[in-house]
């Protein structure tokens, strides 16, 4: 409605004697700013005077006079939108209606607010969820319709009169919509909290009690049970009787069904609070409990471990591990069901008692072949001695033993012979399945454990065999001692160490790598001619003519071996040098004359030097000196020098004659 002033504030505010009241308020005037404000208590409209009558708690006028009551009542608003009020302290007789008379230049309005002031602090209100279940977190809320800036309060939670240790969250609201103080407590109730009293206590700033609210907790929970057993230690012997009783200490709501469980499995037709077990057997040993259900769910008692004692049953032996490898460790375990556990064991190997072995386990750190056989045991406890079971078989496996390689041939063996060998052994577990031979070769194995070497090599020195099952055992190698002709015969120069120069003393050695038998003879030859019968061939002063192809021979009783031909090279400085001229030693001027330096040298001449009749060196280094065009003044004697790594040699002088051409003669 556009003809109304618009106000927003709580409809009713609550307080108690001596507290205060804070009234949040907003407004919007029809036109212009607020010019006059009066706060009435229980205002009544007077038709005669057309004014409101009633107690004036506050007045704001143009002349600015303030009644004494205004010290208690404060207008905290302004001229256009805020109309907040505060009354401090508030009294019981302030209860009723507050009237806010507002006037602008042209408009007037009366706004009414209810104030409820009680004689004593009113109690807060506890709010609980509709259902509380054990161990499920719930939020407890304590609400008080009061909050005032000038009067601080606190809300405290108590359980059975004792402050609760959980932290509460307190919030306040002082808005145009609502005024309250609220405390929220998060809490996980246990079944033991059922029926307990929870209190929310209102206190002033000093912790002084003002008022409270209480509720009784209704905590839904599964049945809580206690189990009792006779005899109390739950240890009996076969044939004894046992009684178990189930007692319900708490259930909310009431329980509906009862059952008994053994080792987690329900026992059929046992639906009472007492379980009677008559003439128990060892199979009835186990963990017992009772289970009682209500609408929340099943509750279980603690478990009772019923032990039915009996003498050991026939034993079995477990072997870790069989088959066992010789040298490994083995453990035997005697397994016998008994209660109480056996205290003594007797062990047997192949039916014979093993002395000093009284434990559940027998450990053999290093197994030998003789440990193989049947192992059995007997267990004993306070109720008696068990029977010996069937036993377990230990299989001890080992590599073949005492392996030998045997030569079947008559001795001595010669290179090229066929040799037969056999591989023998003493014992083996498991059986030998194959054989190996060292060194490897393209050899025949005509039957298992037999080796045939066709055309035996000179270097087949030793042979070894292995007999193999899961492992291979090698025999010591046997020497074939093959006899053969001398091998790797070669000529070796032992003097001089470097290249051979003409005039050097030279020694050649006839080397061979091996011979069996060792006794040998030597022969030297050059170009098919026998030179000597020693291992060395000596030259006191070598000459170029001694160069050529040399061979040596070495023989023993088996045969004869020749070296490769070895070339003896003699190095010497250039010799027999001469200058040859082409086309001849007489050449016509203007033509071409080629001088060639001929020589005999080893190694060949690396470079040449040319000289004229005045022994002046000419700047040429090749074997041929070409003069083109040749001139008459080039006539004269020329000589050459040849150089190799050994030395130098020089030619005698050769004369070149250059004669005039007919043209030159004609011009003269």
């Amino acid at each position: 409605d556009s003809s109304k002033w618009v106000f927003e504030h709580p409809e009713t505010l609550y307080a108690w004697e001596g507290a205060c009241v804070w009234i949040p308020c907003t407004y919007r005037a029809l036109d212009g700013d607020l010019e006059s404000f009066i706060l009435f208590h229980n205002p009544e409209y007077n038709k005669n005077t057309s004014k409101f009558d009633g107690t004036r708690l506050y007045e704001s006028t143009k002349d600015g006079k303030v009644p004494s009551e205004q010290k208690r009542v404060q207008f905290l608003g302004d001229k256009n939108k805020n109309c907040t009020l505060s009354i401090h302290p508030v009294h019981l007789n302030d209860s009723g209606q507050l009237g806010l008379r507002m006037e602008s230049k042209t408009e007037k309005w009366m706004e009414r607010i209810h104030l409820n002031v009680s004689e004593r602090p009113f109690p807060p209100h506890i709010q609980l969820p509709p259902e509380i279940q054990e161990s499920q977190e719930v939020t407890l809320t304590c609400l008080l319709n009061f909050s005032c800036y000038g009067y601080p309060i606190q809300l405290q939670w108590l359980l059975e009169g004792v402050p609760m240790r959980q932290a509460a969250v307190t919030s306040t609201s002082l808005t145009i919509k609502s005024v309250f103080t609220r405390s929220e407590l998060k809490f996980s109730p246990q079944w033991s909290h059922h029926g307990k009293i929870v209190t929310c206590q209102l206190q002033d700033a000093d912790g002084k009690f003002l008022s409270n609210d209480t509720v009784q907790l209704n905590v839904k929970h599964t049945p809580k049970l206690e189990i009792k057993v006779t005899p109390s230690d739950a240890i009996v012997r076969e044939g004894d009787s046992v009684t178990m009783t189930c007692e319900v200490s708490s259930s909310n709501p009431e329980y509906t069904t009862v059952s008994w469980l053994k080792d987690g499995t329900s026992l059929k037709k046992q639906n009472t609070f007492t379980l009677n077990l008559r003439e128990v057997t060892k199979d009835q040993s186990g963990k017992y409990c009772c289970q009682v259900s209500n609408d929340v769910g099943p509750g279980r008692s603690e478990e009772v471990f019923l032990q039915v004692q009996y003498a050991p049953e026939p034993s079995t032996v477990q072997i870790l591990h069989s088959p066992a490898v010789e040298g490994s460790q083995v453990e035997f375990l005697c397994m016998s069901l008994a209660n109480p556990l056996p205290t003594n064991y007797t062990w047997y190997h192949n039916g014979k008692e093993m002395q000093g072995r009284t434990e559940e386990k027998v450990h053999i750190p290093k197994i030998l072949p003789w440990h193989a056989g049947t192992y059995s045991c007997v267990a004993e406890n306070i109720l008696g001695t068990g029977q010996r079971g069937p036993g377990a078989e230990l299989d001890v496996q080992y590599p073949p033993k005492k392996v030998t390689t045997v030569i079947q041939n008559p001795m001595p063996i010669r290179e090229g012979d066929t040799v037969t060998l056999s591989c023998n052994y003493n014992s083996s577990n498991p059986s030998v399945t194959r054989y190996e031979w060292k060194p490897h070769g393209a050899w025949e194995e005509p039957s298992l454990g037999v080796l045939k070497i066709q055309n035996v090599g000179w270097d087949n020195t030793t042979i070894a065999c292995a007999a193999c099952n899961s492992w291979c055992s090698w025999a010591s190698p046997v020497a074939l001692n093959v006899q053969y002709a001398p091998r790797d015969v070669r000529v070796r120069k032992i003097k001089p160490l470097s290249e051979i120069h003409s005039g050097n003393s030279v020694s050649l050695q006839c080397d061979f790598s091996s011979s069996h038998p060792k006794e040998v003879q030597f022969f030297w030859e050059k170009n098919g001619r026998l030179l000597g019968k020693e291992s060395q061939l000596n030259f006191d002063s070598i000459s170029p003519e001694d160069a050529g192809s040399y061979s040596c021979w070495v023989n023993n009783s088996i045969g004869q071996t020749a070296s490769k031909a070895w070339t003896l090279e003699v190095l010497y400085a250039p010799r027999r040098l001469r200058v040859s001229m082409s086309p001849g030693d007489q050449v016509m001027e203007g033509k071409s004359a080629t001088l060639t330096c001929e020589s005999d040298a080893n190694p060949p001449v690396s470079h040449y030097t040319w000289f004229d009749w005045n022994n002046q060196s000419l700047p040429y280094h090749s074997q041929k000196l070409r003069l083109e065009p040749v001139k008459v003044q080039h006539s004269g004697a020329y000589w050459c020098q040849g150089t190799n790594s050994v030395g130098k040699g020089r030619s005698p002088l050769s004369t070149l004659t250059v004669y005039y051409s007919p043209e030159t003669i004609g011009r003269r």
Partner: antibody
Framework: QVQLQQSGPGLVKPSQTLSLTCDIS????????AAWNWIRQSPSRGLEWL???????????DYAVSVKSRITINPDTSKNQFSLQLNSVTPEDTAVYYC????????????WDQGTMVTVSS | VIQMTQSPSSVSASVGDKVTITCRAS??????LAWYQQKPGLAPQLLIS???SLQGGVPSRFSGSGSGTDFTLTISSLQPEDFATYYC?????????FGQGTKLEIK
Amino acid sequence: QVQLQQSGPGLVKPSQTLSLTCDISGDSVSSNSAAWNWIRQSPSRGLEWLGRTYYRSKWYNDYAVSVKSRITINPDTSKNQFSLQLNSVTPEDTAVYYCAQEIEPHDAFDIWDQGTMVTVSS
Amino acid sequence: VIQMTQSPSSVSASVGDKVTITCRASQDVSGWLAWYQQKPGLAPQLLISGASSLQGGVPSRFSGSGSGTDFTLTISSLQPEDFATYYCQQAKYFPYTFGQGTKLEIK
């Protein structure tokens, strides 16, 4: 310290004669241990030895086969210089021409002049 | 005519690097081989004669080796002034012949 200084025209017409002279200072053209060489360089042929003259009791000449029919190298003892004449030139003879001293015992070109660019063009 | 073949024809390297240039003759030239360095616009300069003899004034980082048909020029640690073109030349047979050159460039 031996120095070589070259002179001659930088442009020659085809079929004419190319003439260059090389002045020697610090040594004699008649030295018994040196030889005096002409070498040219072009992008197409690289470095190319043309010929030499030297004195050992008498004067000798050696020429490259590629120019033997067109080349003459002469010493001038009075001016201590040596010259190059190359007849019947073609654009193929366009190159930088160098004179160089060759010294014994290794017969390498140890001293070179700065070179002259000769262009054969009409 | 003796052919002289150089390899590689060009090589890129950095200051401080070691560089090797090879020269092969088509015929045995004994030790009659020289190496030259040429910078743009200048005449070649003799570095090594007789295959391995260093010319006076040439830095010791340059060295030559070889005999017969195969020869090598080695620069042990390149300096900025070494970037140039290098030529080999045989002096045993007429006509004297040069290699085609190896251009050494900055990487």
